[in-house]
């Protein structure tokens, strides 16, 4: 078990010409939030397929209003990390989708509207417990900078979070067959759940469900002592009491193989069988060769026959990067006009047009409200190449399709009590207020004889009533 953590560093216009229009304006302030979706492996999957490894939604960022005439800057971001817990082993290779969403905060009573601003996707190799990996992805004219890592939740450790660690029971060393848990040298690897009945004294396991015997014991559950009649153990001094040789320390005791390598004794010493991605006498050197299949998306791996020589990936058309992990960003040419969102589908480019525009490249300007029905009795409001729905009570979202708790947006002002009603909502006003939403004080606070405005306020100044 563990947690995948994503830190968004910036979201703003990418380099090059054609800076995108700010998603927010003085007329329509907005704020950003992010969604991450994780899938195991490196398979090319549709964006809509399930987030099998998990998904997370960020908090909302600060409200942003564009300064008129200014280019779109990096937009204010939500605080904190996006965290995706995973219950099972970390797969090591994964696909991700990161979506940037805009929450529009117009003056409509119906609540905020959400729209997808940008979506980036990629496939990566990542070992749990490693350092933060930095990345930059582009979607159309937007650029997203972020870091990510996978970390194990105690007691799990290892590059896949499958080994378990527990505090040492004895101060000197770990139990039989158990290794110290680097980097937590004061902890020991906890025994896995071995095959039912496996002898706790004489058996151990490296995979759940198996039962491997310590020297001198045999049988499916390591409960049968090996015959001692010949006493032909090849090492160790004689025991004065039995006349047989007592096993001394072997070369694999304590398992000298790092990074999950398995140890086997040889006539002279020991040999480590290393997992993919590691080599060296003790599997202590991390290295990737062509045998590890490091080239994604059908890339051809050349060189790297031995760990000391680098490999090179020759990428097929449409992909780039040292591991062919990045699509060639054909969207960087900004083929979508009028603020359309560019999607590179590999076999084709697709433009997702902003409301009010249509055509393969969003080149046709539509009547904002033409053919755009607002559901559930909402009315369409034109403006700035984007249609907005002013929703009827009880509904929200961009097209008024989302059923809303009519009281969720605090629709009663000045401390009025909101009651959900089959026809919408009813506000019960606090004493001294009236109006359908209690928005009108009958006698504004402190307004004595003939001031030009309420005390402490210049006329035209705002005053907050909650």
């Amino acid at each position: 078990a563990g947690v995948f953590e994503l830190q968004i560093h910036s979201f703003g216009p990418g380099p090059g010409p054609g800076a995108p229009r700010s998603p927010c304006s003085a007329r329509l302030p907005c704020r950003l939030f992010f969604r991450v979706c994780l899938k195991p492996g490196l398979s090319e999957e549709a964006a809509e397929s399930p987030c099998a490894l998990g998904a997370a939604l960020s908090a909302r960022g600060p409200v942003y209003t564009e300064q008129p005439g200014a280019p779109a800057p990096d937009l204010p971001l939500p605080d904190g990390l996006l965290q995706v817990p995973f219950r099972d082993a970390w797969p090591g290779t994964f696909s991700f989708i990161i979506e940037t969403w805009r929450e529009e905060l117009g003056d409509q009573i119906g609540g905020p509207a959400w729209s997808l601003l940008a979506r980036v996707a990629g496939r990566r190799r990542l070992a749990a417990g490693g350092p933060w990996a930095r990345d930059i992805q582009r979607a159309g004219a937007w650029e997203l900078r972020f870091s990510y890592r996978a970390r194990c939740e105690p007691p799990a450790v290892g590059t896949a979070c499958t080994r378990l660690c527990r505090p040492r029971s004895a101060p000197s060393r770990c139990g039989p067959g158990l290794r110290p848990c680097a980097p937590l040298e004061d902890e020991c690897e906890a025994p896995l759940v071995c095959r039912a009945g496996c002898s706790p004294e004489h058996g151990f396991c490296e995979q759940p469900g198996e039962c491997r015997c310590l020297e001198g014991w045999t049988g499916p559950l390591c409960t049968v002592p090996v015959s001692t009649s010949s006493c032909l153990s090849p090492r160790g001094p004689s025991s004065a009491t039995t006349g047989c040789l007592v096993p001394g320390p072997g070369p694999c005791d304590g398992n000298p193989c790092a990074n999950g390598g398995s140890c086997s004794e040889t006539p002279r010493s020991f040999e480590c069988t290393c997992p993919r991605g590691f080599y060296g006498l003790r599997c202590e050197v991390s290295g990737v060769t062509c045998a590890d299949g490091p080239c994604f998306n059908g890339g051809l791996c050349v060189g790297g026959a031995d760990p000391d020589s680098a490999y090179i990936c020759h990428c097929p058309p449409g992909f780039q990067g040292s591991n062919c992990e990045k699509r060639v960003d054909r969207c960087s040419l900004q083929p979508c006009r009028n603020g359309g969102l560019c999607l590179d589908l590999g076999h084709a480019l697709r433009c997702r047009c902003r409301a009010g525009f249509a055509g393969p490249r969003c080149e046709h300007d539509l009547d904002d409200c033409a053919g755009r029905a607002c559901a559930n009795g909402g009315t369409c409001v034109e403006g700035g190449g984007a249609h907005r729905c002013s929703c009827a009570l009880g509904f929200g979202g961009r097209d008024c399709r989302e059923r809303a708790d009519p009281c969720a947006a605090r629709p009663c002002a000045h401390g009025g009590r909101c009651y959900a009603h089959f026809s919408g909502l009813v506000c019960a006003c606090a004493p001294g207020y009236m109006g359908a939403r209690c928005e009108f004080p009958v006698h504004p606070d402190g307004a004595s004889a003939l001031p030009a405005a309420p005390p402490g306020l210049r006329p035209g100044d705002p005053q907050r009533y909650l």
């Epitope: 302030p29 905060l105 117009g106 003056d107 409509q108 009573i109 002013s390 009570l393 629709p411 002002a413 109006g435 359908a436 939403r437 928005e439 009108f440 035209g460 100044d461 705002p462 005053q463 907050r464 009533y465 909650l466």
Partner: nanobody, 117 residues
Framework: EVQLVESGGGLVQPGGSLTLSCAAS????????MAWYRQAPGKKRELVAG???????DYIDSVKGRFTISRDNAKNSVYLQMNSLRAEDTAVYYC???????????WGQGTLVTVSS
């Protein structure tokens, strides 16, 4: 920031009519709840009429049937049509706006209405 500018005040004889206008900037009036208040010399400011963002209207009892509040979204303005004016309607009339997104209230500078023969 919402700015409100009133106009249309003046001197009128009892029984006469007057229309007050309030032009808003900084937000659409269709998104605001707006009202007219008045303050007579030596008295507290009081609500006269209000129009909520959803279009529902409210009036104090003393002006029901005589005053009408309305909204023109195209002109981004709110109006108060005052008929059958009486001497007790003499006051400074203020435009008021309540902005739902910020929960802030805004006031205009006021326009004087004098009903006298």
């Amino acid at each position: 920031e919402v700015q409100l500018v009133e106009s249309g005040g003046g001197l009128v004889q009892p029984g006469g009519s007057l229309t007050l206008s309030c032009a808003a900037s900084g937000s659409k009036v269709s998104f605001l709840s707006m009202a007219w208040y008045r303050q007579a010399p030596g008295k507290k400011r009081e609500l006269v009429a209000g129009i909520s963002a959803d279009g529902s209207k409210d009036y104090i009892d003393s002006v029901k049937g005589r005053f009408t509040i309305s909204r023109d979204n195209a002109k981004n303005s709110v109006y108060l049509q005052m008929n059958s004016l009486r001497a007790e309607d003499t006051a400074v009339y203020y435009c008021y706006a309540y902005r739902w997104t910020t929960r802030l209230t805004y006031w205009g500078q006021g326009t004087l209405v004098t009903v006298s023969s």
